[in-house]
């Protein structure tokens, strides 16, 4: 570590005095101190002498000696006071710039340590400091305003009490800059705009920042628009607003609008699209198939997307039949707005009953007219089966009727013994009926088919079973011949309740 002679931390001299500061180190050494006149520097290998033969108050300051080659970077310092009765202050800088919440050092150095007890910091023209100004003083360095605020950007003077009167330093201008976290915050409203040719429109682009130094512009496609800027300051933010007012829109006004704001931190931009149309429009669509099939007892949500301008004047869901004149309960109809011009309407149909199959229509109206979108809802049912014994054209025939949706397939089984249902071990014969006769097939109803099995002789210790199945489930009916006559047996599980 270098050594300074004289080996005292502070040296007090009078104006005009000769001052010699010598620094010695292992290698070459360098002096660093306040920029002041009259110093001469003499270096000789490992020592360096700083001297003046006419010290002035401007030489007041801390002089530091460093050894550039020292890996530990050690240094030694001495503080020189040149106590001038007429000049209690040596101001090293007349402008200090800091960011908010940093400590601001106002470098007015006291030229006489004895005066320390009577120092104070004031604003120019004797005005007191602003409330909540937290500051401290060091005779070596000056006044420090702690955690400086933007509002403390003022002109200050350092005051010392000399012989009962206050003597001021020259003024120091403090500039406290706002910490700009990034580019200005932006809003562009609306996010999307549709207008009919000839209508009025308004697009508002606004930007705000803690600092007033930022630019904002509104751009259409690639053209920067000339819009008078409105400026404001509230909530501690500067706001600049550009309002594009169009009295009568035309097709050339359509396109992409970008709100762009920039400051030293960079640029932000946000965009919206403006559509100009010839006339009102109303479009209905659904992501679902308009023909829906649902198993009875289950639920279904019907969804319609609406794109419209101007807004809807009316809308509703209607049941068009064919079963009853019931209408969907309003509480089951739900509307959500995706954005200004797009909406989704949902009709919830929980635990569907047979009477709720049919056509459901969503109707909407705006100045462009009426539009409707109709869903066809068919319910799926598992088959219901019944078997009877009859004679057709003199032949004994088992007649199986199966009813369900989708159309059931029919299979006959003959098995040994009397049973409610044939199992594999008992099966003697299986007949598939690929083309059962369709007895009824109306929209939204079950399909009823009939299958005939001609039996020349009924075997009494056997069971004849008609099985029907579709994509929903299956049903069966066992027919057991008895000597006294035929006996039919529906299986227990057929007791079906939708």
């Amino acid at each position: 570590i270098p050594v300074i002679e004289p080996s005292v931390p502070e040296l007090v001299v009078k104006p005009g005095a000769t001052v010699t500061l010598r620094c010695v180190g292992n290698g070459s050494v360098e002096w660093d101190g306040p920029p002041s006149p009259h110093w001469t520097l003499y270096s000789d290998g490992s020592s360096s002498i700083l001297s003046t033969n006419n010290a002035t108050f401007q030489n007041t300051g801390t002089y530091r000696c460093t050894e550039p080659g020292d890996p530990l970077g050690g240094s030694a310092a001495i503080h020189l006071y040149v106590k001038d009765p007429a000049r209690p202050w040596n101001v090293l800088a007349q402008e200090v710039v800091v960011f908010e919440d940093q400590d601001a050092l106002l470098p007015c150095l006291l030229t006489d340590p004895v005066l320390e007890a009577g120092v104070s910091l004031v604003r120019v023209r004797g005005r007191p400091l602003m409330r909540h100004t937290n500051y401290s003083f060091s005779p070596w360095h000056g006044f420090t305003i702690h955690r400086a605020k933007f509002i403390q950007s003022q002109d200050y003077q350092c005051s010392a009490l000399m012989g009962g009167r206050k003597v001021m330093s020259i003024s120091i201008r403090l500039k406290v800059q706002k910490v700009i976290p990034g580019p200005p915050a932006l809003t562009l409203v609306p996010a999307e705009l549709v207008r009919i040719r000839g209508e009025a429109a308004q697009i508002v682009c606004s930007a705000s920042s803690v600092d007033v130094n930022f630019d904002v512009f509104l751009q259409h496609n690639n053209t920067k628009l000339a819009i008078p800027q409105q400026s404001d300051f509230h909530n501690n933010r500067y706001q600049k607003v550009l309002t594009l007012n169009l009295d009568q829109v035309d097709f050339q006004h359509a396109g992409n609008y970008s709100c762009v704001a920039s400051n030293v931190q960079g640029k932000h931009s946000t965009s919206m699209f403006f559509r100009v149309v010839e006339s009102a429009y109303l479009n209905l669509s659904s992501e679902q198939n308009l023909i829906q099939e649902v198993t009875v007892g289950e639920g279904l949500n019907l969804k319609v997307m609406v794109e419209a301008y101007p807004g809807l004047q009316g809308f509703n869901w209607t049941y068009l039949g064919p079963f009853s004149d019931h209408q969907p309960e309003p509480k089951l109809a739900n509307a959500t707005t995706k954005d200004t011009y797009r909406h989704t309407f949902t009709l919830s149909l929980p635990r569907l009953k047979p009477s709720e199959a049919g056509r459901y229509s969503f109707l909407a109206r705006n100045p462009g007219g009426w539009r409707a979108l109709t869903f066809e809802l068919t319910l799926r049912y598992p088959p219901e089966v019944s078997v009877i014994w009859t004679f057709i054209n003199g032949s004994g025939t088992l007649l199986c009727a199966a009813s369900g949706y989708p159309q059931p397939n029919v299979t006959w089984l003959q098995c040994s013994g009397h049973t409610d249902r044939c199992d594999e071990a008992q099966v003697l014969q299986v007949w598939d009926d690929p083309y059962p006769e369709v007895l009824s097939q109306e929209p939204f109803h079950k399909v009823t088919v009939q299958s005939l099995l001609t039996v020349e002789t009924l075997e009494h210790n056997q069971t004849y079973e008609c099985r029907a199945h579709n994509s929903v489930g299956s049903g069966s009916w066992a027919f057991i011949p008895i000597s006294a006559g035929a006996h039919t047996h529906p299986p227990d599980e057929f007791l079906f309740t939708p």
């Epitope: 690639n222 053209t223 628009l225 000339a226 819009i227 008078p228 400026s231 309002t243 007012n245």
Partner: antibody, heavy 118, light 113 residues
């Protein structure tokens, strides 16, 4: 519909001042810059400057600096141009023109003839 | 200031015939940032205020017949009338607005032969 209606003709002596008004209607006055253009008899068009009706900020052509003042009163949607120290070569028709956001002058006042004569 | 020079200063035309007015600027009116050329054309009919014909080089103003067209690039510009009609008489001005002060050409007087 958009209209810019200017004040009537003026006759002034050299050295005097004149103030011409331009009342806007049919649109949002503060949403468009207002420019002033003049035309000496039998001559071409000459741009004088513009005012931001929002802030009152102005920009004047160098030729008129120090002699021209553009102001506005947003409460009555009116823009004004005042020209001082009039000379005979200031005799002209003075027009106000609304600047469309796309930059061109889409609406013009009917013009105000200012005659400077001793 | 940017100087705008129009030619011819007078243009006698027979109705139904085409007409062409030239305008030259002392520096480029092309904005390299957005690619637009900031030149407009105005028509001042006798006894009337000027009215906009063409803006930003080639865009026709609302209500302007399609017989009017603007073209050009950089410093040389042209206003064309495909078939002159009697109502087209007046003085045509080009104007630059790429920078302040805005400046106009001297005007071209179109008259019917």
């Amino acid at each position: 519909q958009v209209q810019l209606v200017q004040s009537g003709a003026e006759v002034k002596k050299p050295g005097a001042s004149v103030k011409v008004s331009c009342k806007a209607s049919g649109y949002t006055f503060t949403g468009y810059y207002m420019h002033w253009v003049r035309q000496a008899p039998g001559q071409g068009l000459e741009w004088m400057g513009r005012i931001n009706p929002n802030s009152g900020g102005t920009y004047y052509a160098q030729k008129f600096q120090g002699r021209v003042t553009m102001t506005r009163d947003t409460s009555i949607s009116t823009a004004y141009v005042e020209l001082s120290r009039l000379r005979s070569d200031d005799t002209a028709v003075y027009y106000c023109a609304r600047k469309n956001p796309w930059g061109h002058f889409d609406y013009w006042g009917q013009g105000t003839l200012v005659t400077v004569s001793s | 200031d940017i100087v705008m020079t129009q030619t011819p200063l007078s243009l006698p035309v027979t109705p139904g015939e085409p007409a062409s007015i030239s305008c030259r600027s002392s520096q480029s009116l092309l904005d390299s940032d957005d690619g637009n050329t900031y030149l407009d054309w105005y028509l001042q009919k006798p006894g009337q205020s000027p009215q906009l014909l063409i803006y930003t080089l080639s865009y026709r103003a609302s209500g302007v017949p399609d017989r009017f067209s603007g073209s050009g690039s950089g410093t040389d510009f042209t206003l064309k009338i495909s078939r002159v009609e009697a109502e087209d008489v007046g003085v045509y001005y080009c104007m630059q607005r790429i920078e302040f002060p805005y400046t106009f050409g001297q005007g071209t007087k179109l008259e019917i032969k």
